[in-house]
Interface confidence: low
């Protein structure tokens, strides 16, 4: 049985300040059941950017219909990028549970922010 992989195809993305950043993430399987979360940074101090299951993330939208059961694309768009958004973003698959437990992380995508074009 092939184990699920979390694929972040872009090692880095460069976006001008004020624009939107698209961070790509796909998974290779619907198994195991559980939500996707996006984080900036790694380790205990990482910042939650988006949780598929719950929460309010006004600057984040999903590129595809992430609630549909056959969906395997968990790419997100972050609007109105500022220099404070720079960092490495990780797409992380969780296994359903009580609580949900981390199953596998993507390799990360480094977001760099260019100066706003004059």
């Amino acid at each position: 049985e092939e184990e699920l992989q979390v694929i972040q195809p872009d090692k880095s993305v460069s976006v001008a300040a004020g624009e939107s950043a698209i961070l790509h993430c796909t998974v290779t399987s619907l198994i195991p059941v559980g939500p996707i979360q996006w984080f900036r940074g790694a380790g205990p101090a990482r910042e939650l950017i988006y949780n598929q299951k719950e929460g309010h993330f006004p600057r984040v939208t999903t590129v595809s219909e992430s609630t549909k059961r056959e969906n395997m694309d968990f790419s997100i768009s972050i609007s109105n990028i500022t220099p404070a958004d720079a960092g490495t973003y990780y797409c992380v698959k969780f296994r359903k549970g009580s609580p949900d437990t981390e199953f596998k992380s993507g390799a990360g995508t480094e977001l760099s922010v260019r100066a706003k074009p004059s």
Epitope: L30, I31, P32, V33, T67, R95, K96, G97
Partner: antibody, heavy 118, light 108 residues
Framework: DVQLVESGGGVVRPGESLRLSCAAS????????MSWVRQGPGEGLEWVAG????????WYADSVKGRFTISRDNSKNTLYLRLFSLRTEDTAIYYC???????????WGLGTLVTVSS | EIVLTQSPGTLSLSPGETATLSCRAS??????LAWYQQKPGQAPRLLIY???SRATGIPDRFSGSGSGTDFTLTISSLQSEDFAVYYC??????????FGGGTKVEIK
């Protein structure tokens, strides 16, 4: 054809134990999370417990936590539920149900009746 | 825990009529809601998942709609075999997974 066949129900006294089994056939058992759902006499449906596809994660309703244990043997295509410290309010038909993606139940067994009575 | 409230408790209709069943969630469950049919002495049967997608083999007279907290199951042109109890179930914020209390559709 997908088939789920429960067994092991019966009449027990309060405080006693029981083990329910669910034999699965007609699908790749190890590719699915599984659950037990019960229905008291003349009552609605109550989700009892669930288990991840390889058995590494289990979760329970508050009403049975610490008293019931869900497990599975993928080599035997069998789901189990051990019921300890049974109470009269545990009297119900216990259904084995296959979870689809997103945790709804696409196939159900016919159920096995557990009666707890002094 | 998300509470699902189904209404009405009982619906008395004649064959050929349309049944409209409601399910309200205490929190937003997006489109993560399923509907089941249960006849006396039988196990539940999946009708609708993802709020509006019909399960395999379910006739198109069954349709689901809604998202967020308010959902509807509509059975158009009721057939004799449709008289049963119907349950909704959320899977948007589980576990625990929760079911509604059920709506009985009976012959008038």
């Amino acid at each position: 054809d997908v088939q789920l066949v429960e067994s092991g129900g019966g009449v027990v006294r309060p405080g006693e134990s029981l083990r329910l089994s669910c034999a699965a056939s007609g699908f790749a058992f190890s590719d699915h999370d599984m659950s037990w759902v019960r229905q008291g006499p003349g009552e609605g449906l109550e989700w009892v417990a669930g288990i991840s596809l390889r058995g590494g994660v289990t979760w329970y309703a508050d009403s049975v936590k610490g008293r019931f244990t869900i497990s599975r043997d993928n080599s035997k295509n069998t789901l189990y539920l051990r019921l300890f410290s049974l109470r009269t309010e545990d009297t119900a038909i216990y259904y084995c149900a296959r979870e689809s993606w997103n945790t709804f139940f696409d196939y159900w067994g016919l159920g096995t009746l557990v009666t707890v009575s002094s | 825990e998300i509470v699902l409230t189904q209404s009405p408790g009982t619906l008395s209709l004649s064959p050929g009529e349309t049944a409209t069943l409601s399910c309200r969630a205490s929190q937003n469950v997006r489109s993560n809601l399923a509907w089941y049919q249960q006849k006396p002495g039988q196990a539940p049967r999946l009708l609708i998942y993802d709020a509006s997608s019909r399960a395999t083999g379910i006739p198109d007279r069954f349709s689901g709609s809604g998202s967020g907290t308010d959902f509807t199951l509509t059975i158009s042109s009721l057939q004799s075999e449709d008289f049963a109890v119907y349950y909704c179930q959320q899977y948007g914020n589980g576990p625990p997974l929760t079911f509604g209390g059920g709506t009985k559709v009976e012959i008038k």
